[in-house]
Every structure is written in C-alpha cells, then in structure tokens.
C-alpha cells in the first residue's frame, strides 16, 4: 500500500531533547529543519547531520538522513533541511526500477550496435542499432552483487496515506 | 485491508509480567505510530502510550512509565506491549490502535486490534 | 489529566428516531493552532472501539451520514440523525489536545 518516501510526499503536513531548539508553530506548521512537539506547542530543531524536514510541517519527528552506501559516493551532506544526496560511483548507475542499488555499466555494445550515450550515475551507456538506429533494450547482464536493506534511499518512513 | 491481530487471553499473578502482540498487516507498518488503550471491566478507555516504528521512539503516559514497555519487531510487522509488576487493577482489555505520524492527524485511532484479556489473578 | 464527562451514561433509543450524547471536558480542547482534537468512537457488543468522528465533525471513512458532530470549548454533542439497529453499543467521546490522551467514561446506546 505504501512505498518509502522523501519529505516531498510528506509536504506539507513532523523527540525532543532538552538542548534542541525550541520556536512556536505558525498555523500549527514548523519551518524546515524543525518537527513539531508531542503537545503541537512548539517546534524542535532537527539533529544535524542526523535528521532533517524539508517542508512547513506538523510531523512529530525528523526525518533520518540517508546514509550512503559503498559503490556511492556522498554529493551533499545531509543538513537539518536537506537529505544526503548520493550518487553511484564512476562506471555504475543506479535504475529508475531498481533505485535501490547502483549496477555495473556494461563495458561495450552487443555486436551490430554502436555506442551513442556514455555511462552515466543514472544511465547505462546507451546502444543503438548500426543501420537502423533504434535503440538496444536487451537485457542488461547480470551483475554479481549483493543487494542490502540500505538505511537511506530514502531514509524516511512509509507513505502516510491510509 | 488494515487489520491488527492481537494475541490471545493471559492469566497472570500479582507482580508477574505480560506480554501482548498485535500485528499488523494492510499497511506500511513503519507509516504509522502503533498506540496501546487498555479498557479494565466496567471502566473506560485509558490511552498508555504509542511506539514509533520508523525510528524507535516511545511516548508513554505518565501514570505507565516505567511499568510498560513498547517494542516492535519490523521484519514481522509486530508491535508488543510489555506492562510488568502485574497488579489485580491491571485486570483489563488491551487494545492497540494506529494513529499518523502528524500532530493534527495523529491523536486519534483509525484501526484497533481486537483486543486481548489480561487477568490478573492469584 | 483532562476529564471527560459523557451525559446521560445510558440511553434507550427507539429505531427511527433521532438521538444526542453529550460530552463536556475539564478543560477547553481549543488548541492554541486554533484546532479542537475532539473525537468519537463506537464499540459494539463484544467488539473494539471503531473511529465515527475526528476533530469534532469530520465523519471518518465509511461512517453513515446520520452520524454527524458539533461542539466547541468544553461541550460536544454526537447525534444520530434516525437510530438504527446496529447503531447500538457504548459511544466514547476523547480528547487528544492535551497529553495524556483521555477518554470519557461511554455512554450506552440500547433498543427500547
């Protein structure tokens, strides 16, 4: 019924310890780097580095930063307003159906087909047909890896609708 | 469709402790708080406290804390409630219930398991 | 802790005809957002409780029409528009503006 999410689907409706700082609500709402207190009275600042918001919002927590795995490398830390983004690492790309995990880049193009897109952190290299010029939608090899229950991608909870 | 199974009737002695299980399918588990009520014979309802799946936090009523303790096993969709130092009061229907991770929409329990019969008894 | 009083504790109704429950807190449940986290519930015999109404009026999913809610401050009312047979059981009003969440004791809804 529900996918994991980020603070976008979340928007815009977020423990407090006693250092964390502390503002009232605007129309019941918190700023980002914030969540609201259990008694909605206040707002408490995310752990930087540990959780963030993104959006105005009424959650009772902060959201977990994502933690980058091995075969990613970390383009932005996370802050109390921002998720970590992460990237896979040269010669790997991550697949819209398989976000979970950065596969390995094919090296070369089946024959009769020539290279038209280079390997990207988001895209295989790209194959098109020498005479045609249609693209290749052949299945990629498979890449010995093990898939982990990563803590990030993203690090947030379920969708909230129900 | 949302359902929260609870486990079945306990006999227990004074200053024993209790372990109730309700799990829950229908749902993203980590989504939402999982909230524990308990309704003793002829009494009404009392809220004790709620579990936050997604990253562990509990809130627990006052007049429960120390005394109860909230846990959940993710891999099972399973949230428990421990109430220890058993006393015949503690006699009661318990109940858990979902509630939204939000402030507006999170005081209330769209979903309650069946509820489990605790006695306490010598 | 806030007190919730239900009035009256038991009420023979009659099929077809309109009912009322009444429920007062200790406290104003106006929340300084301006909100009021006044709530309804309904168990049935040898059931649990099951959500009608949130935040005062605000029907929940599946809830019949005749079931509706009003009230501000401290006083609250659930009415059923035309009781029917399966409407029976203890109505529970709650609170969740102020921590801890209450409840009122129930007030017991029977077929004359």
């Known amino acids: 019924e529900s996918a994991l999410i980020t603070q976008q689907d979340l928007a815009p409706q977020q423990r407090a310890a006693p250092q964390q700082k502390r503002s009232s609500p605007s129309e019941g709402l918190c700023p980002p780097g914030h969540h609201i207190s259990e008694d909605g009275r206040d707002c408490i600042s995310c752990k930087y580095g540990q959780d963030y918001s993104t959006h105005w919002n009424d959650l009772l927590f902060c959201l977990r930063c994502t933690r980058c795995d091995s075969g990613e490398v970390e383009l932005s830390p996370c802050t109390t307003t921002r998720n970590t983004v992460c990237q896979c690492e040269e010669g790997t790309f991550r697949e819209e159906d398989s976000p979970e995990m950065c596969r390995k880049c094919r090296t070369g193009c089946p024959r009769g087909m020539v290279k038209v897109g280079d390997c990207t952190p988001w895209s295989d290299i790209e194959c098109v047909h020498k005479e045609s010029g249609t693209k290749h939608s052949g299945e990629v090899p498979a890449v010995e890896e093990t898939v982990t229950s990563s803590p990030g991608t993203p690090a947030s909870p379920c969708s909230l609708s129900g | 469709q949302v359902q929260l199974v609870q486990s079945g009737a306990e006999v227990k002695k004074p200053g024993a402790s209790v372990k109730v299980s309700c799990k829950a399918s229908?749902?993203?588990?980590?989504?939402?708080?999982m909230n524990w009520m308990r309704q003793a014979p002829g009494m009404g309802l009392e809220w004790m406290g709620r579990f936050n799946p997604y990253n562990g936090d509990t809130f627990y009523n006052q007049k429960f804390k120390g005394r109860v303790t909230l846990t959940v096993d993710k891999s099972t969709s399973t949230a428990y409630m421990e109430l220890s130092s058993l006393r015949s009061e503690d006699t009661a229907v318990y109940f858990c219930g979902r509630s939204a991770y939000y402030f507006d929409s999170g005081g209330y329990f769209d979903y309650w398991g069946q509820g489990t019969l605790v006695t306490v008894s010598s | 802790d806030i007190v919730m009083t239900q009035s009256p504790l038991s009420l023979p109704v009659t099929p077809g005809e309109p009912a009322s429950i009444s429920c007062r807190s200790s406290q104003s449940l106006v929340h300084s957002n301006g909100n009021t986290y006044l709530h309804w519930y309904l168990q049935k015999p040898g059931q649990s409780p099951q959500l009608l109404i949130y935040k005062v009026s605000n029907r929940f999913s599946g809830v019949p029409d005749r079931f509706s809610g009003s009230g501000s401050g401290t006083d609250f009312t659930l009415k059923i528009s035309r009781v029917e047979a399966e409407d029976v059981g203890v109505y529970y009003c709650?609170?969740?503006?102020?921590?801890?969440?209450?409840f009122g004791p129930g007030t017991k809804v029977e077929i004359k």
């Open positions: 229908g749902y993203s588990f980590i989504g939402y708080f």
């Open positions: 709650s609170q969740s503006t102020h921590v801890p969440w209450t």
